[in-house]
């Protein structure tokens, strides 16, 4: 006899990195018939939705109107139908930006390049942390650290066309805790021979729609989220 | 056009410091990495480190993190390079170059150590 | 630290001549490599950057290639001009380092 059912998938909308004092929705999506729902924050019971009619649900919400730094770190999600609870869904790193600073970023030798050159991204943040992390922006994004007293560098290698796209950093006060957004730095990988010397770093856009990037990177990958966040998540770790 | 413009020469005492600049035009000063590189007489190049002006990124060649600090000016688009506790050895030419690849040179500063 | 050996260090050759210098890495540095042309009062000017892209204005006798390890800079017909000193510089893996130079000689 099956003594507990499969575990939930467990994702943010619209992310995991949530700008501080910007709303959040935890979403957990277990079985129609499940009777509740808990959210466990760092550990403990944080939450509790109990869907009604639970036949017709199997997916609730926990909203975070405004996050904060407390509010950051790990979630988890379990579901119950009858007496029978759940297996613990995957962990989710909530992740609280824009505190403190902004860190700048550069690439080398320039954001304009030829496919075969070796570049390195460097990020510097003069404040108080000694780990970084660099973003591709994009369905595929992945997260690298680093680490350094005032910036890191994170080396590419031989590029190729793949890793044309938009990158930007944070410092990292501690797992869940990251700076603001750096200027987003768009890298351009060419195969041909023109001459890219002094061309000017050009940013898709400013800092400020960082927020509606996040709103909107997503759109149309719901049944991807929690694939998505898990994989970035476990750069993370 | 890109011009990196250096002093001819500088002429400094062992143990003192100089402080050698390199001031860009004809291109957006902000926006590139600068070189410094050292020549001694009849020698080869060495690569000292380079800054991004906008950034304030720095990267030194462990050979000389101890020796050399680099800053910038963007107000007057001008890259510095101070060199300290000078002896004999620092005697050289210093250039600076602009852009990630190196694509534009300066001239050069002569520096020489003497007493 | 990657080593760039240049080969030979020096060379007599003729006007009209073809001549390769060549640079072998220590490591990988993909197209990360420059040439350099040094005149004897000291002016330095990139003639060649990511292997095989000619800088503009440079003449096109000039041309840049790779084979493994191995890169070289090709001068297809020597002008009087060009009797200076040459350098490869990779700015792969730092610290960048260049090789020891070319002393390019009339015959």
């Known amino acids: 006899q099956q003594q507990t059912l499969p575990k939930p998938f467990i994702w943010a909308e619209p992310h995991f990195m949530v700008p501080k004092e910007k709303q959040v929705t935890i979403c957990c999506q277990g079985n129609y018939g499940a009777v509740e729902y808990q959210l466990h924050f760092e550990g403990s019971l944080f939450a509790v939705d109990r869907p009604k009619p639970p036949e017709r649900i199997n997916k609730v919400q926990f909203y975070i109107p405004d996050m904060n730094s407390r509010m950051a770190g790990q979630y988890s999600c379990i579901y119950r139908v009858g007496e029978l609870w759940s297996e613990p869904s995957n962990l989710l790193d909530l992740v609280v930006t824009e505190m403190y600073d902004t860190p700048t970023l550069s690439v080398h030798p320039g954001p304009e390049v030829i496919s075969g050159e070796k570049v390195t991204f460097y990020c510097r943040l003069d404040t108080a942390t000694s780990m970084f992390l660099l973003l591709k922006e994009g369905r595929s994004s992945h997260v690298q650290r680093g680490y350094g007293k005032v910036q890191a560098e994170f080396p590419l290698g031989p590029v190729t066309t793949a890793h044309r796209g938009t990158y930007r950093c944070f410092g990292s006060y501690n797992n869940h805790a990251w700076s603001f957004p750096s200027e987003p730095v768009k890298l351009l990988v060419t195969g041909d021979i023109e001459n890219t010397s002094l061309a000017p770093e050009d940013p898709t856009f400013p800092a400020d729609t960082w927020g509606t990037y996040l709103l909107t990177t997503e759109t149309g990958l719901q049944k991807d989220h929690a694939l998505w966040d898990h994989t970035a998540q476990n750069l993370l770790r | 056009q890109v011009q990196l413009q250096q002093p001819g020469a500088e002429l400094v005492k062992p143990g003192a410091s100089v402080k050698l600049s390199c001031k860009a035009s004809g291109y957006t000063f902000t926006s590139y990495w600068m070189h410094w590189v050292k020549q001694r007489p009849g020698q080869g190049l060495e690569w000292i480190g380079m800054?991004?002006?906008?950034?304030?990124?720095?990267k030194y060649n462990e050979k000389f993190k101890s020796k050399a600090t680099l800053t910038v000016d963007k107000s007057s688009s001008t890259a510095y390079m101070q060199l300290s506790s000078l002896t004999s050895e620092d005697s050289a030419v210093y250039f600076c170059?602009?852009?990630?690849?190196?694509?534009?040179w300066g001239q050069g500063t002569l520096v020489t150590v003497s007493a | 630290d990657i080593q760039m050996t240049q080969s030979p260090s020096s060379l007599s050759a003729s006007l009209g001549e073809r001549v390769s210098l060549t640079c072998r890495a220590s490591?990988?540095?993909?197209?990360?490599l420059n040439w350099l042309q040094q005149e004897p009062d000291g002016t330095i000017k990139r003639l060649i950057y990511?292997?095989?892209s000619l800088d503009s204005g440079v003449p096109k006798r000039f041309s840049g290639s790779r084979s493994g390890s191995d890169y070289s800079l090709t001068i297809s017909s020597l002008e009087s001009e060009d009797f200076v000193d040459y350098y490869c510089?990779?700015?792969?893996?730092?610290?960048?380092?260049f090789g020891g130079g070319t002393k390019l000689e009339i015959k």
């Open positions: 170059a602009g852009d990630g690849r190196f694509a534009y």
């Open positions: 990511a292997t095989s």
């Open positions: 800054i991004h002006p906008n950034s304030g990124v720095t």
């Open positions: 490591q990988d540095i993909g197209s990360s």
């Open positions: 510089l990779q700015y792969a893996s730092s610290p960048w380092t």
